[in-house]
Every structure is written in C-alpha cells, then in structure tokens.
C-alpha cells in the first residue's frame, strides 16, 4: 500500500488474558464509512480476513475468531471475546469508501503470574565449595509476557557476581501461550548464611500498571566445621530433686559431631560415659542430689575423626534430706509441755514452718514447737515443713502424731434415732482419748470397729429393730485405761414416708433410713442433726 | 529412778506459813503433773492440789482453796506449796507425788514431811 | 463427791479377797490402788482397766462395773497386810482428785 510507512504508530490496546478487548475503529468519516468495513489480524506480517461490516451488519469469516468477534457501538468495535496470549498482534479496519484506508491497533495481552514457588537445595552447601552451588529455585507460572526474576538475600538483592553469586533463568511456553518462569540461584555461601533468608521476586505488567510477588523466605542448610562443643542444662535456674532435667551437648559445626556426655565420678575422678537418649539428650528423672557433679561433653566429627571436648559444667540438683522430727511419737499428760524439734539437712538454706494437720494453720516460723499447758483438744497431727525458700516447690515434711492421755470423749451424749420396727438398723458410734479406746454396745447386734486415727475410733452396729430395742434404747460404752464413758441412742417409731429431710425438730435427732428385715445384709445411713452441747 | 524428797515441814502456830519443797529427778519433770497428798495422823490419804507439767494449769481440794498455793520451777525440778492461815486440822505428813504418765493419778510418792500446827 | 471403801476387811492366808470401792466418778474413771504400810509412803499396786505396775506380783488385780471398783488379792500374802485406798479423779469432770476412806487389810 503507498506510503505506508508514514503511517503513524498504531493505537495501543491491553488487556489481560481471558478478558474481553475492544477494538475501536479510528477512521475518520472522511476516511471512509464505518458501516462498510473490513477487519483483518496480521500476524508474521501477513494478513488474515476476520470480519465483515456491510450495512451496519457484522459477519466473522471463518477461523480462529469466528465465535469470539462481535460488533459494538454502533458498528465501529469490534469486541474480541476470551482474549488470549495468541491474540497478542495487530488488528486492523479497512473502510472501502470513498477510498480504500485503514487503522492500526496493537494488542497487548497480560497475565499475572502464580505466586512462586521456591524449593531450597535439600541437601545443603558446605561452605568449602570451590565455585557457586545451588541454593534454591524459584518458579513462576502462567504469567504473561514472561516476568522479570530478582532474588533477595536478607531483604537485600542479589546481583551476578563472578564466582560469588549465578542466577541461571530459563523459561518454557504453556500450550495455554503462558510462560513458566524457572530461575536457579547459585551462590557460595559462608558460615553466616546459615540463617540468612532467602526468598524470589517476580516483576510482571499488567494493564494497571506495574505488579510484583514475592515467594516465602527460606533458609538453606549450610555444612560448616565444628569448632566448638558446649553442654547446655535445661531447665536454666535452680535445679531441684524431683525435676525432669536435660542435659544436651551442643555443638557450633552443621552436621554437628556424635556426642558423648561424661560426669567425672567423685571417688576416682575419672570421667564416666553417661548414657544418652536417641538424640544425644542425658535426662535425669526424676533428678536426685546424686545426680550432682561434673559433666561434659566430647563432640566426635566422624569425617574427619578431630574430637572436641567441652568446658566442663557443674550440676547441683538442689535437695531437701527426709525430715527428723523428735520426740518421733510424743505421748502428754494434759496440763504439760511439749517440745517438738524439727531437723532436715539441704543442699541450701532451709525455712522450717510448723502446721497444725487438722486447719494447716502455722503455729510456728522455725524447726521447734513449743507447746505449753497441753489440753485434750491439743492431740492430733502437727506437720513440720522444710522447704528452701529459694527455690519453690523444693520442700519435704514430717507429720507427728501428738497424744495427750485422757479418758474416752464421745463424739456425742445423747441423740434420738428415728426407725421402724423390723429394719435393720445402721448406727454408729465415735470416741477419742488416749489410749485408743475401744467401743462395747449393749445389745446384740454385728459391730465392727476401725480405727479412725491414733486416738480416735468409730464403731458402727447393724441391728434389728424389735419392740424390746424400742424399750432399752441403745448404748455405747467407750473405755481405756484411764476411763470409760457412754452415748445413748434414743430410738423412736416413725413412719418413713412422713418424714422429709427439712422436718422441723426442737430436740438434737439423727434419722436413719432403714431396710426391711427381710434385706438384713443393707445398712442405713444416719443423717446427723444438731448434737447436745455436752459431749462427755 | 524416780526420787522425790520434801523438805519445809515443821511446827508453825496457827495462822502461820509455811513453805514445803520438792525436789525431783529421774525424770523429766516438766512433762508430769505433780500433786500434794497429806495424811493426818492415823487417817487415810487427803488430795490436796495438783499442777500441771507446764504450771499452767492448778487444782486445789476445797478444804485448802484460798490458803495453799502450788507452784514449780521446771528450770530447779522443784515442786512448792505455799501453805497460809494454817489450821490445827492442816497438821498431817504432806507427800510430794508424781503422776502417771497417763496423768489423773499418782504413781510415784516421797517419803513425806511432817507440817504440825500447834500453839 | 466421795469414794466409798468399807473399813476393814479380813483374808485368811493364801486365800482370795476383794476390796470395793464406791463413788459416782467410777462410772467414768477407772480406780488406781495404792498399798500403804505403817510408816511408809502409798505404793500403786493397780491402775487403769486392770494394769499393775512392774514389781508388783499378779495376785493383785482390778475390775469395774457401773460406780463400783474393785481390787482383788488372789491367794494372800502375810506381807499384803496393809491400808488400800482407791483414788480417782471427780466426778464433775475437772481436774481435782479423790481418795477412798481405806480399808485395813488384815491377814489371818
């Protein structure tokens, strides 16, 4: 066609893959009329009939664009439906009156990539190398037109550099049309790099403007020498009995050497291989105080048979010793004094307490408890701690049973039992004094004792409710060798299913729920109500 | 061996005082509580006081209540009646006793001293 | 309250005798027994349920029921000849003592 080179550029259109693009017709009226025109695509310089406007009527010749073509506006766009990288070419409109002009757009077609993939070498870099090993790859797929690759170490890009640092790029073409963008880094790599980060960067276009992504961070295992062995305790901080403790060898070379931990025995002074877990891990537990001592750790590396060994490090698994109280067994008269010395060694300070069992109550700050002016209530337990305030949860304890003598204490007086006649009845009966006492009842019946603590007793009796029962009533004689007392049971006639728990009652009662006879084996259980004040 | 030995006795007019003392060993003293019994000549045995261990806590017969008083000295292993307003009816060998280690009755007794209250 | 023990009582050598002892405190207390020979101070021969202290012989021993006490010599010995008292704590439940009248033990 005559003067086509003075044609000026052609009118620029970008879309991005899968969309639609509008191709808009930029003749003039006085270059020809739109309703009578011509649409080709030029592709390796030749031209291919695409589409027909006669009479404002559109009609896509056969081929690649025969279904994606459409008129628009009125006849001068051309849409082209489901764009791809393949459509990346010129299209022009010719208009055939008055005379033959035409009108240039280049199609420009974009995709933006998948995020990267990145994949560190998996099998490390020794630092040793002589040139540039591969470090990591990186892969960008699907984008369009091929994107720019930038690697960063650090957050800081990485340039070429003679027999420093390689980035080999290859790409391959999708039968979509869509690039796959494949970069290797290769770099030598120093000691330091072991924690360096390294990650990929992919810079692409878009119709928008300019877009980058950018892969995870990675680091890659580097192999260095191992210049240095160490041991390491966990947990840090006082160590006391009882504690699962870690002791690991640590080592500054990768692949660290095989370990061995030694503690130097105290007798001979030799050092002793201890024996370690499957990862090289000594763990004492629960750690004792004879865990205590010397340690350290030889690091073997197997290559080149060069045997490390540590600073040695002393262990102190901190301990509280069983604690001593004396008198062991302390029997009182009621009226006397009472002193009770505590006594535990420790591999530090120790605090002692003094506890009363029964409230935990702290009566003392100190190893010895001084009671004076002993009284009945004054028996039972007294519990001496021994703790390191240093250290918590470091504590051992001694409980001593304190007896003062005097005769037998009922748990009560008098109390009225509320039962039917033919039940096998439940009751119970308690005492205390020292010595123990023993419990006797006087009616016949299946009695079984136990004993409560060292100066307390209870004694419990099945028996069958008949009217002679009814009449006597029950008793508990409770005796030892300074006395003897008594607890009656009261036993009245009721109809059980009167009775509800919240019935009102001026008098000190106890019901019981019975079995009929004819379930003698089941016992009832007393429901305690208010007691008589006196106890006896 | 458990030895109690009185001493203080003696002839005191009435209305006089007098001081009776014992002393104890062979045990631990502060842990008993130690009693005064008296026995008026050809009569049967007469409680009159007890102390505890700690000489926290004392007793008295109601014949002496007011006038007698009990004390110790757990640092001297010592035990004291301090006896006032003596009647002639006070007249009687006192004896120093021991309880049991039960407590509430005697089990060791001294040899006595004899408190006449005579004008 | 009072401890009651009849005077005086006799045994014919190598026989069995019984010396009782009354009161409202023995219901809850057990009896001690005391020996006593002229010129001579109390010496326990029983205590408790029935427990003598070391030294002293087995034919001595004690027992109780309701408000009595009562001491027993099994087979008596010239040498029991002696005054017993029996002696508990009050009745009222504080900390005073009582003693028994005594009973003048006579063996023929």
């Known amino acids: 066609v005559p003067g086509e080179a003075e044609q000026p550029a052609p009118e620029l259109v970008e879309v991005e893959v899968g969309s639609t693009a509008l191709l808009k017709c930029g003749l003039s009226q006085s270059q020809g009329n739109l309703s009578h025109v011509d649409w080709f695509s030029v592709h390796k310089e030749k031209r291919t009939l695409i589409f027909r406007v006669r009479q404002g009527q559109g009609q896509s010749e056969p081929g690649e664009y025969e279904q994606r073509l459409s008129l628009q506006d009125r006849g001068a766009t051309l849409a082209l439906t489901q764009v791809t990288p393949q459509d990346e070419r010129i299209f022009l409109c010719q208009g055939k009156r008055p005379r033959s002009q035409e009108y240039r757009i280049q199609l420009r077609v974009y995709k933006a990539p998948e995020e990267p993939n990145i994949q560190v070498n998996p099998l490390g870099i020794p630092v040793n190398s002589k040139e540039p090993e591969e470090v990591a790859t990186c892969v960008g797929r699907n984008g369009y037109p091929i994107p720019q690759v930038i690697w960063y170490k650090n957050g800081r890009p990485l340039k070429e550099e003679k027999n420093r640092v390689h980035i080999q790029s290859s790409q391959t073409v999708e039968s979509s049309g869509l690039y796959t963008l494949q970069s290797i880094l290769k770099a030598q790599l120093v000691k330091e790099d072991k924690d360096a980060q390294f990650y990929c960067e992919l810079n692409y276009r878009l119709p928008s403007g300019n877009h980058m992504k950018e892969s995870r961070e990675v680091t890659v295992p580097v192999f260095y020498p191992t210049e240095k062995v160490w041991l390491e305790v966990e947990p840090v901080g006082m160590l006391k009995e009882g504690d699962r403790v870690e002791i690991r060898c640590l080592a500054d070379g990768n692949p660290p050497p095989h370990f061995s931990i030694s503690k130097q025995n105290p007798s001979t002074r030799e050092a002793e291989e201890e024996t370690t877990n499957d990862n090289g891990v000594l763990v004492l537990e629960p750690a004792r105080k004879e865990h205590s001592g010397r340690y350290e750790c030889q690091g073997l590396d197997l290559d080149t048979m060069i045997s490390l060994l540590s600073e040695p490090q002393e262990l102190l698994v901190n301990y509280v010793s069983d604690v001593r109280v004396s008198p062991a067994a302390p029997e009182r008269q009621e009226g006397s004094s009472l002193t009770l010395t505590c006594e535990a060694e420790s591999s530090q300070d120790l605090e002692f307490q003094w506890l009363r069992e029964e409230t935990g109550q702290v009566l003392e700050r100190g190893p010895v408890l001084q009671l004076h002016d002993l009284k009945r209530e004054a028996g039972g337990g007294y519990r001496c701690v021994a703790s390191v305030p240093s250290i918590p949860g470091l504590n051992r304890t001694q409980l001593v049973n304190v007896a003062i003598f005097g005769p037998p204490w009922m748990a009560f007086k008098e109390r009225k039992v509320w039962v039917k006649e033919n039940m096998v009845l439940n009751l119970s009966c308690e005492a205390s004094g020292h010595p123990r006492p023993t419990i006797s009842w006087n009616v016949n019946g299946t009695a079984s004792e136990q004993d409560q603590d060292p100066q307390r007793v209870l004694s419990t009796l099945n028996v069958l409710v008949t009217p002679e029962l009814l009449e006597t009533g029950v008793e508990c004689t409770a005796s030892n060798d300074l006395g003897k007392n008594t607890s009656i049971l009261f036993l009245e006639l009721v109809n059980l299913t009167t009775l509800t728990p919240d019935s009102n009652t001026t008098t000190g009662l106890s019901t019981s729920t019975a079995s009929p006879h004819t379930r003698a084996n089941s016992t009832s259980t007393e429901r305690k109500l208010p007691e008589p004040e006196s106890r006896g | 061996e458990v030895q109690l030995v009185e001493s203080g006795g003696g002839l005191v007019q009435p209305g006089g005082s007098l001081r009776l003392s014992c002393a104890a060993s062979g045990f631990t003293f502060s842990s008993y509580a130690m009693s005064w019994v008296r026995q008026a000549p050809g009569k049967g045995l007469e409680w009159v006081s007890a102390i505890s261990g700690s000489g926290g806590s004392t007793y008295y017969a109601d014949s002496v209540k007011g006038r007698f008083t009990i004390s110790r000295d757990n640092s001297k292993n010592t035990l004291y009646l301090q006896m006032n307003s003596l009647r002639a009816e006070d007249t009687a060998v006192y004896y120093c006793?021991?309880?049991?280690?039960?407590?509430?009755?005697?089990?060791?007794w001294g040899q006595g001293t004899l408190v006449t209250v005579s004008s | 309250s009072e401890l009651t023990q009849d005077p005086a009582v006799s045994v014919a050598l190598g026989q069995t005798v019984r010396i009782t002892c009354q009161g409202d405190?023995?219901?809850?207390?057990?009896a001690s027994w005391y020996q006593q020979k002229p010129g001579q101070a109390p010496v326990l021969v029983v205590f408790g349920k029935n427990n003598r202290p070391s030294g002293i012989p087995d034919r001595f021993s004690g027992s109780s029921s309701g408000n009595t006490a009562s001491l027993t010599i099994t087979g008596a010995q010239a040498e029991d000849e002696a005054d017993y008292y029996c002696?508990?704590?009050?009745?009222?439940?504080?900390?005073?003592?009582?003693f028994g009248g005594g009973t003048k033990l006579t063996v023929l």
């Open positions: 006793a021991k309880d049991h280690d039960y407590g509430g009755f005697i089990d060791y």
């Open positions: 002696h508990s704590r009050d009745s009222s439940g504080t900390h005073l003592r009582v």
């Open positions: 405190s023995l219901r809850s207390y057990y």
